[in-house]
């Protein structure tokens, strides 16, 4: 469960893939589309507001007691819109919604490298945001070794 209704910190950053493609957001027909693309040299990167929340491990999963903390994140590229996991369609979508946000908007933060992060669905453990055919998709990761798979690694940067 999320231990507080307020984020413990917020961080505005651009999101790019392990291979330095940018994650961009475009308003089309009153809904937002998410793209994974190479930007031209001086093109401005889209920013995402990452909100970090503390969360306790479910008690049956961990012997950590009060110490069993994870970081959950929500990702918002524009006011009132958040990335959502659509587990049925294995897709990542931008939905407009009000707080409190649904569980589909929360992702467990991992960093396998000091400068790379991964986002695991709160609603579907073992499933991560990843890159598939130049779009964001939900990708099943079957073992901890595969957490280093490049298509689920993202870089955060302030520039």
């Amino acid at each position: 469960s999320i231990t507080g209704i307020s984020p413990i910190t917020e961080y505005l950053a651009s999101l790019s893939t392990y291979n330095d493609q940018s994650i961009t957001f475009a308003l089309e027909d009153e809904s937002y589309e998410i793209y994974v693309e190479d930007l031209k040299k001086d093109e401005k990167k889209d920013k995402v507001l990452l909100s970090y929340y503390e969360s306790q491990h479910p008690s049956n999963e961990s012997g950590d007691g009060v110490d069993g903390k994870m970081l959950m994140v929500t990702l918002s590229p524009t006011k009132d819109f958040w990335l959502h996991a659509n587990n049925k369609e294995h897709s990542v979508e931008l939905h407009k919604c009000e707080k409190p946000l649904p569980d589909q908007a929360f992702f467990v933060l991992h960093n396998m490298h000091s400068n790379c992060v991964s986002f695991e669905c709160k609603t579907d453990p073992g499933v991560f945001i990843g890159v598939k055919d130049n779009h964001l998709a939900l990708i099943k990761v079957d073992s901890s070794e595969n957490l280093c798979t490049e298509n689920i690694l993202f870089k955060l940067s302030e520039t």
Partner: antibody, heavy 121, light 106 residues
């Protein structure tokens, strides 16, 4: 209760090797990044090395790169620091620490009591 | 590499005083900053994480603030048991400690 117990420190001559161990208990070891931090006598804290929860990624202070190796055995809840080609400037208390949050390299929630390494001829 | 500079090196204050310790980063660290307390002969202890979040069990007289490159640890009413050295620590890019501020009672 979280516990981290370091062993393996001692007096060693310059150029020789030493291996430190840190046995962890009271938490799900394989979920957490682990760290070694050192403190020379009367000085401040210095981060030395980090290892991610599955052991696949390791990081080092520039001055120990190529000489020190961090590793972990998740089955035995133990993290190690193999220290080779030791120098007098490596003399310090070495602390083992665990990450604050599962899966991420943020903050040191718990520290061991430290083990003293003295490099002297 | 990010450098962390703490000031002052030594701070002497009376019991009950409001005490402010400063930490400056060489680059923006996006609030990825902790404060640790170390008493003589003891291991360090986490006080504050992500700039302003109080670790469980730490008295509420400790608080943290800041953003960008400038961060502060405040002790609202200094107590004798607060005599220690305080270290800031960044984890936005790599891992770096400040050199410490020693807090003494006048």
């Amino acid at each position: 209760e979280v516990q981290l117990v370091e062993t393996g420190g001692g007096l060693v001559q310059p150029g020789r090797s030493l291996k430190l161990s840190c046995v962890a208990s009271g938490f799900t070891f394989s979920n957490y990044w682990m760290y070694w931090i050192r403190q020379a006598p009367g000085m401040g804290l210095e981060w030395v090395s980090s290892i991610n929860n599955d052991g696949g990624n390791t990081y080092y202070l520039d001055s120990v790169k190529g000489r020190f190796t961090i590793s972990r055995n998740n089955a035995e809840n133990t993290v190690y620091l193999q220290m080779n080609s030791l120098r007098s400037e490596d003399t310090a208390t070495y602390y083992c620490a665990k990450g604050h949050f599962s899966y991420t390299s943020y903050s040191f929630a718990y520290w061991g009591q430290g083990t003293l390494v003295t490099v002297s001829s | 590499d990010i450098q962390m500079t703490q000031s002052p090196s030594v701070l002497s204050a009376s019991v009950g005083d409001r005490v402010t310790l400063s930490c400056k980063a060489s680059h923006n660290i996006n609030k990825h900053l902790d404060w640790y307390q170390q008493k003589v002969g003891e291991a360090p202890k986490l006080l504050i994480y992500f700039t302003n979040n109080l670790q469980t069990g730490i008295p509420s007289r400790f608080s943290g603030s800041g953003s960008g490159t400038d961060y502060t640890l405040t002790i609202s009413s200094l107590q004798p048991e607060d005599v220690a050295t305080y270290f800031c620590f960044q984890y936005n890019s790599g891992w770096t400690f400040g050199q410490g501020t020693k807090v003494e009672i006048k």
